[in-house]
Interface confidence: medium
């Protein structure tokens, strides 16, 4: 699975968007998880109705919430008041029993508030490197993270 | 006990229609996505079409697309499969399936239609 | 289209005998595999979905594996009732296909 990037400003709100073939997951719930590590755990943020006609219904788990387009096939993620800590990488998933595939791997990246003078230092996000230039745009606020990005910032 | 029962086929020649029937019980219809598959004399299964709410939401294989309809009357239980401009290779059983989660769960005995002249 | 081919088309087998019927698919299909069974007299049953997850009602005789292209069937010890058609079925990508199936028959 390739990564998306989307990006949102600290205090705002970021909607994030996992498209699915509706066919192949009918009948299948979904989940917003969070990667531990690079090679850790996908820790459950938030999933769909317990009922998965219900699917369509926002379920929210603190400042995150979940909804689910069944036919139109399109997993919606959306984080209330963006902050630092929000960062990282976060997984979309169809789950099946006690098993999860992975819908769409998405890195989310909290930007400055323009309009927020105080210090900016705890804000993190990877810096832009040279392969960016081809990256594919979901929308104006997110890319594909491209072969060799690093997508969990650098330990000290 | 989920049941599905096939109607109408039979033998029909090239270039006309025939519509088939798949009626439904033991389960709740409207709530469940449905599909036809097809299986051609001594040969193998081959998927049609699905419907997973309604007209709005169907899905065919390429060689029956513009030629059939996949339909359904939620306050009959009933599934449709409308087959226009029928050829030779549409021969074949016809079997209504329930489709769940990741599998057709329930299949019906089948209806034959013999496209000839 | 995904193809897939099984092997073999036809197995002859002894009952209380232990046999494996293969399904490749021409590109990884990531587990979305189902197994059906089908009677002579045309009556179509689910076995395994999702590669290896039995079918309610289905005996436990039964099993799924397999990952990227490669899957399998097996059936632990046979029983009269499995001698029948086998087909598997990919639901990874639109249109679905079946293997070509594997016919069970009494040695």
């Known amino acids: 699975h390739n990564t998306t990037v989307f990006q949102g400003v600290a205090g705002q709100s970021l909607q994030v968007s996992c498209p699915y073939d509706s066919m192949k997951h009918w009948g299948r719930r979904k989940a917003w998880c969070r990667q531990l590590g690079e090679k850790g755990p996908c820790q459950r943020v938030v999933s769909t109705h317990n009922l998965w006609l219900l699917s369509f219904l926002r379920r929210w788990n603190g400042s995150t919430a979940i909804t689910d387009d069944t036919l139109g096939g399109t997993l919606t993620i959306t984080l209330r008041n963006l902050q630092p800590h929000d960062a990282g990488l976060y997984q979309c998933q169809s789950l099946h029993g006690s098993e999860a595939d992975t819908l769409r791997k998405v890195l989310v990246e909290v930007l400055a508030d323009p309009l927020d003078h105080r210090d900016a230092g705890d804000l993190w996000f990877p810096g832009e490197s040279e392969s960016f230039e081809d990256a594919h745009v979901e929308h104006s606020i997110s890319r594909s993270l491209l072969e060799g990005e690093i997508p969990f910032p650098p330990t000290s | 006990e989920v049941q599905l029962v096939e109607s109408g086929g039979g033998l029909v020649q090239p270039g006309r229609s025939l519509k088939l029937s798949c009626a439904a019980s033991?389960?709740?219809?409207?709530?469940?996505?449905m599909a036809w598959v097809r299986q051609a004399p001594k040969k193998g299964l081959e998927w049609v079409a699905t419907?997973?709410?309604?007209?709005?939401?169907?899905y065919y294989r390429d060689s029956v697309k513009g030629r059939f309809t996949i339909s359904r009357d939620n306050a009959k239980s009933t599934l449709y499969l409308q087959m226009d401009s029928l050829r030779s290779e549409d021969t074949a059983t016809y079997y209504c399936?329930?489709?769940?989660?990741?599998?057709?769960?329930?299949w019906g005995q089948g209806a034959s239609v013999t496209v000839s002249s | 289209d995904i193809q897939m081919t099984q092997t073999p088309s036809s197995m002859p087998a002894s009952l209380g005998e232990r046999v494996t019927i293969s399904c490749r698919a021409s590109q990884g299909i990531s587990n979305y595999l189902n197994w059906y069974q089908q009677k002579p007299d045309g009556t179509i049953k689910p076995l395994i979905y999702?590669?290896?997850n039995l079918q309610s009602g289905v005996p436990s005789r039964f099993s799924g594996s397999g990952s990227g292209t490669d899957y399998s069937l097996t059936i632990s010890s046979l029983e009269p009732e499995d001698f029948a058609m086998y087909y598997c079925?990919?639901?990874?990508?639109?249109?679905?296909?079946f293997g070509g199936g594997t016919k069970l028959e009494i040695k």
């Open positions: 079925q990919q639901y990874d990508s639109s249109p679905w296909t």
């Open positions: 419907i997973i709410y309604d007209t709005s939401s169907t």
């Open positions: 999702y590669t290896s």
């Open positions: 033991g389960f709740t219809f409207s709530d469940s996505a």
């Open positions: 399936a329930l489709f769940g989660v990741d599998v057709m769960d329930a």
